[in-house]
């Protein structure tokens, strides 16, 4: 599982007084010399770039996305991978480097006017001219030309959470991604049994806010596994 990999990662050798180990959500750091990774006793120097385990794109750097390192590999073990440059194959926007987005399986330039047209066209195509709303979000979403200068407000089209204003995250909505509110205490959240399963959601929820975690609601403990309701609760 992802956690077993993470828990066995320990950084044994960083220049004093600093050190680190990859853990999720928390990890311990020790100061001693080299980096020991699971599955072997080989120490690696600090100069080498070390894989960073992740569960979602937002945990990675701006030029990375979160995925299984091997094609068809265990979906439970994901690391931050280098983003794909223009004209490279992709499956979602976050796989493409900043300034690009994923269109028809290829990373293409998101120069503002071009990008706006593409997003609008894609969403309008999907829903025809029906401008009714679902879950309080407009079905026809256009990309504001200001998005590249100011943080997206609720409902703005986004590629990653860093495009959204504080208190919002970038989450899938139909076949697009828009800024949605980070969940508050008591709100229903999605607990993914298997890492990577959030790729299947058409209406993706944000994560729980600061000091909260997504846990099973106490009065739902007796319910069957499939119908258990998770809510954001204080740690």
């Amino acid at each position: 599982t992802l956690n077993s990999v993470l828990n066995s990662n320990a950084i044994k050798n960083l220049p004093p007084p600093l050190g680190g180990a990859a853990g999720h959500p928390g990890s311990a750091v020790s100061a001693a010399p080299g980096i020991l990774y699971p599955g072997g006793n080989k120490y690696q120097t600090i100069d080498n770039y070390q894989p960073y385990p992740c569960a979602e794109d937002e945990e990675c750097g701006t030029d990375e996305y979160c995925a299984s390192p091997t094609r068809g590999g265990d979906a439970g073990v994901q690391i931050c991978l280098a983003c794909r440059k223009r004209r490279k194959r992709c499956m979602r926007h976050a796989m493409c480097c900043p300034g690009n987005y994923c269109k028809n399986g290829i990373c293409v330039s998101s120069d503002q006017n071009h990008f706006r047209g593409e997003i609008e066209e894609t969403i309008t195509e999907s829903f025809g001219n029906d401008h009714s709303t679902l879950d309080g979000y407009s079905r026809r979403t256009t990309l504001s030309s200001k998005m590249y200068h100011t943080k997206g407000q609720e409902g703005s089209v986004c590629l990653r959470s860093s495009d959204c204003a504080s208190g919002l995250c970038c989450a899938r909505h139909f076949w697009s991604k828009i800024c949605k509110p980070v969940l508050k205490e008591g709100q229903v959240c999605t607990k993914h049994r298997r890492k990577g399963s959030h790729g299947l959601e058409i209406f993706q929820r944000c994560y729980c806010g600061e000091g909260l975690s997504c846990r099973i609601q106490k009065d739902h403990h007796q319910a069957s596994n499939s119908s258990r309701l998770h809510t954001c609760q204080r740690h």
């Epitope: 600093l18 990859a22 750091v29 070390q50 937002e58 945990e59 990675c60 701006t62 994560y207």
Partner: nanobody, 129 residues
Amino acid sequence: EVQLVESGGGSVQAGGSLRLSCTASGRPFDNYAMAWFRQAPGKEREFVAAISWSLSRTHYANSVEGRFTISRDNAKNTAFMQMSSLKPEDTAVYYCAAAPRPKRVSVQYFVTSSNYDYWGQGTQVTVSS
């Protein structure tokens, strides 16, 4: 002007608790990692804990794992560190720091002080036995 201001330091008996706060002003810090470092008299500054921009990733020094908890509230531009089961060896000046989300992330990124662009003035924590 960007500023990080720490608060919550003080004197406490061994086994006691403190909660440090770090409030950032001058810009939004939701795309920054926030961390705490400390420096005891005559020693080098050392990494204590960090929390990523995504809120979901935290990293701790082995010496504080299980005793300290780092968290943040992006809406308030504030980071926190709950310190419990304090020991005399935790006595130090505690500094809050902010590092921009990098192009490539690694654990080393969070624990390396030179990656942090902004630093607070520090708050003194004294733990007596």
